[in-house]
């Protein structure tokens, strides 16, 4: 993977992909974040590793993406959950799994859900389970808006760069 | 569908969509591939049929999409799986279903997973089942990179143009 | 789109100096529709509420999106379904859930499926269930084409702006 075994700054440099050599007439803000696999009971977004990146003004603050300029963005996220069979001695209770992308804007004093996916899982004996959720859509966003995620079932996340991610790009 | 009942070349022509008649100031590489429904136990991508296409430099080689120019691309894929109930005489074993978009780059000697979705299915008596998986995200890719897919559960794919597809477009 | 509505020479100029503020220099047709939560047993798309919008020529017609200009579009949709446990006295029958984005062009006497997702749900005693479906892809569309959806399981839809939506944007 780009920058594996390199220092963070060298990894960043290694991941700078060649660009078309034209004057930047149209900046194209884009971001792709991955869930930090070293944090098992939380979902921390990272942009400085593997194939994750922040481009043309996107930045990360308090685990949220900051919208660099007003316009329409396509925003997306995926999570994968997994679980083992419950122990015969334990009670099998249903698991509510959910993942949501939220908008926090100075216009509103609360987080507005933009994208929501949900699932009920009923673990059984000898039955490991796996479940994937993906969603994405186009939204009119304002400079300074904060995009964040909320997840129910964090302990069950399969944290890898290809399974748990969050991103956006300007249209 | 455009070109239904036409020879392949006539179908191709029928599918040429009207374009804006301006010099191509901004080429927009894009591709949408569909799983070949005539190949039941493999997943072969096709771009010369139904609503599939390759535009502005994308090409298909060894069942992989070749990235035409360095930059950021949105890459996506979907699969739908289905299965019948297991026979009462047969043992019901869990089915592991997975679909992954992978990157093969001259930088690395292995396939890097970009997008992964997974599911465990437990077929039951008299219970036909259906499951859909979709994922997509933005990636920094380099000219010549190869995008391919790997699927567990290929015999269970519901191969139609609207259920099994793989595509990418430059941002 | 670059230079739409300009004379050829003005269009050329606009493309050589992308920062010139000419009308129609960068139209970006986009639409995001949400399912009307006040209509419980149908799926009516709305663009005049919450975070929904129609931009740069997208329009609605008979619950369909009208394609504003010929070109390649990314088209997407999501639905979330939910259900209660069946009553012990009632028979539990499998539920077929499906969501499809369709193209209608009067070239053909039928709706062409573009995106399809499907699921079989087997409601159990004391087991409420939830299921999400998402899909999206790039298609070559023609000015005036009609994009619509067809859903099996409408009474089970979780109608909220973040769970049930349908959109498209020009690439």
């Amino acid at each position: 993977l780009p920058g594996v075994g390199l220092t963070p700054s060298a990894a960043q440099t290694a991941r700078q992909h060649p660009k078309m050599h034209l004057a930047h007439s149209t900046l194209k803000p884009a971001a792709h974040l991955i869930g930090d696999p070293s944090k098992q009971n939380s979902l921390l977004w990272r942009a400085n590793t593997d194939r994750a990146f922040l481009q043309d003004g996107f930045s990360l603050s308090n685990n949220s993406l900051l919208v660099p300029t007003s316009g329409i963005y396509f925003v997306y996220s995926q999570v994968v959950f997994s679980g083992k069979a419950y122990s015969p001695k334990a009670t099998s209770s249903p698991l509510y799994l959910a993942h949501e992308v939220q908008l926090f804007s100075s216009q509103y004093p609360f987080h507005v859900p933009l994208l929501s996916s949900q699932k009920m899982v009923y673990p059984g004996l000898q039955e490991p389970w796996l479940h994937s959720m993906y969603h994405g859509a186009a939204f009119q966003l304002t400079q300074g808006d904060q995009l964040s995620t909320h997840t129910d079932g964090i302990p069950h996340l399969v944290l890898s760069p290809s399974t748990v991610f969050f991103g956006a790009f300007a249209l | 569908l455009p070109g239904v009942g036409l020879t392949p070349s006539a179908a191709q022509t029928a599918r040429q969509h009207p374009k804006m008649h301006l010099a191509h100031s901004t080429l927009k590489p894009a591709a949408h591939l569909i799983g070949d429904p005539s190949k039941q136990n493999s997943l072969l991508w096709r771009a010369n049929t139904d609503r599939a296409f390759l535009q502005d430099g994308f090409s298909l080689s060894n069942n992989s999409l070749l990235v035409p120019t360095s930059g950021i691309y949105f890459v996506y894929s979907q699969v739908v799986f289905s299965g019948k109930a297991y026979s009462p005489k047969a043992t019901s074993s869990p089915l592991y279903l997975a679909h992954e978009v992978q990157l093969f780059s001259s930088q690395y000697p292995f396939h890097v997973p970009l997008l992964s979705s997974q599911k465990m299915v437990y077929p039951g008596l008299q219970e036909p089942w259906l499951h859909s998986m979709y994922h997509g995200a933005a990636f920094q890719l380099t000219q010549g990179d190869q995008l391919s897919t790997h699927t567990d559960g290929i015999p269970h794919l519901v191969l139609s143009p609207s259920t099994v597809f793989f595509g990418a477009f430059a941002l | 789109l670059p230079g739409v509505g300009l004379t050829p020479s003005a269009a050329q100029t606009a493309r050589q100096h992308p920062k010139m503020h000419l009308a129609h220099s960068t139209l970006k047709p986009a639409a995001h529709l949400i399912g009307d939560p006040s209509k419980q047993n149908s799926l009516l798309w709305r663009a005049n509420t919450d975070r929904a919008f129609l931009q740069d020529g997208f329009s609605l017609s008979n619950n369909s999106l009208l394609v504003p200009t010929s070109g390649i579009y990314f088209v997407y949709s999501q639905v979330v379904f939910s259900g209660k446990a069946y009553s012990p006295k009632a028979t539990s029958s499998p539920l077929y859930l499906a969501h499809e984005v369709q193209l209608f062009s009067s070239q053909y006497p039928f709706h062409v499926p573009l995106l399809s997702s499907q699921k079989m749900v087997y409601p159990g005693l004391q087991e409420p269930w939830l299921h999400s479906m998402y899909h999206g892809a790039a298609f070559q569309l023609t000015q005036g084409d009609q994009l619509s959806t067809h859903t099996d399981g409408i009474p089970h839809l979780v109608l909220s702006p973040s769970t049930v939506f349908f959109g498209a944007f020009a690439l």
């Epitope: - | 455009p2 969509h17 009207p18 374009k19 804006m20 008649h21 | 739409v4 509505g5 129609h24 139209l27 047709p29 663009a47 005049n48 509420t49 929904a52 919008f53 129609l54 931009q55 740069d56 020529g57 329009s59 609605l60 017609s61 008979n62 009208l66 394609v67 504003p68 200009t69 010929s70 062009s105 009067s106 070239q107 023609t142 000015q143 005036g144 084409d145 009609q146």
Partner: antibody, heavy 118, light 107 residues
């Protein structure tokens, strides 16, 4: 330069039919739909419907469905409006129009007057 | 169908005046509104699209604003060639409907 020229207007008896033509030039005919819009004398504008010459896709104002048929001939770069069962209130100037984006009527013909009278 | 109600139906103004025409939609139409200018015996001309964007070649004295149900066309300094009838049109859903028109006459 985009040009649209309508023809076929004139006096029609109530209950009769008309077929209007719209000859297009100055652009690739199959890249854009052709709309028909009408305007009764001293009144406002009313959208009738459109046809896409590329794939013959159509969309009509429900008010005219069943009475209006919009079609095109790619080989002649011409669009047509056929109206049946005409009544006095169909008296109007009929315009064809080519959009930039679908609902923006950017280019117009000069119009052709249809008078429905006995 | 969505109804578009224009006001006033006519107005008299002098060269150099600031003129404002309003259009109200019977339901919210986002920013999907266009404005047209029509002179006697001529076809209409597109002036404004998407509520506030001037079409190619339209002078900067023309501006549009509004979203939802209420829209405005403003001519900041009326010129002799601006005397005409102006129509608003909703582009939100078919059948795309026009307002009844506002005739701008010389005072």
């Amino acid at each position: 330069e985009v040009q649209l020229v309508e023809s076929g207007g004139g006096l029609v008896q109530p209950g009769g039919s008309l077929r209007l033509s719209c000859a297009a030039s100055g652009y690739t005919f199959t890249s854009y739909v052709i709309h028909w819009v009408r305007q009764a004398p001293g009144k406002g504008l009313e959208w009738v419907g459109y046809n896409n010459p590329y794939n013959d896709g159509t969309n009509y104002n429900e008010k005219f469905k069943g009475r209006a048929t919009i079609s095109s001939d790619k080989s002649k770069n011409t669009a047509y409006l056929q109206m049946n069962s005409l009544r006095a209130e169909d008296t109007a100037v009929y315009y064809c129009s080519r959009p930039t984006m679908l609902p923006w009527f950017a280019y117009w013909g000069q119009g052709t007057l249809v008078t429905v009278s006995s | 169908d969505i109804q578009m109600t224009q006001s006033p139906s006519s107005l008299s103004a002098s060269v150099g005046d600031r003129v404002t025409i309003t259009c109200r939609a019977s339901q919210a139409v986002s920013s999907a509104v266009a404005w047209y200018q029509q002179k006697p015996g001529k076809a209409p001309k597109l002036q404004i699209y998407s509520a506030s964007h001037r079409y190619t070649g339209v002078p900067s004295r023309f501006s549009g604003s509004g979203s939802g149900t209420d829209f405005t066309l403003t001519i900041s300094s009326l010129q002799p060639e601006d005397f005409a009838t102006y129509y608003c049109q909703e582009n939100y859903s078919t059948p795309w409907t026009f307002g009844q028109g506002t005739k701008v006459e010389i005072k």
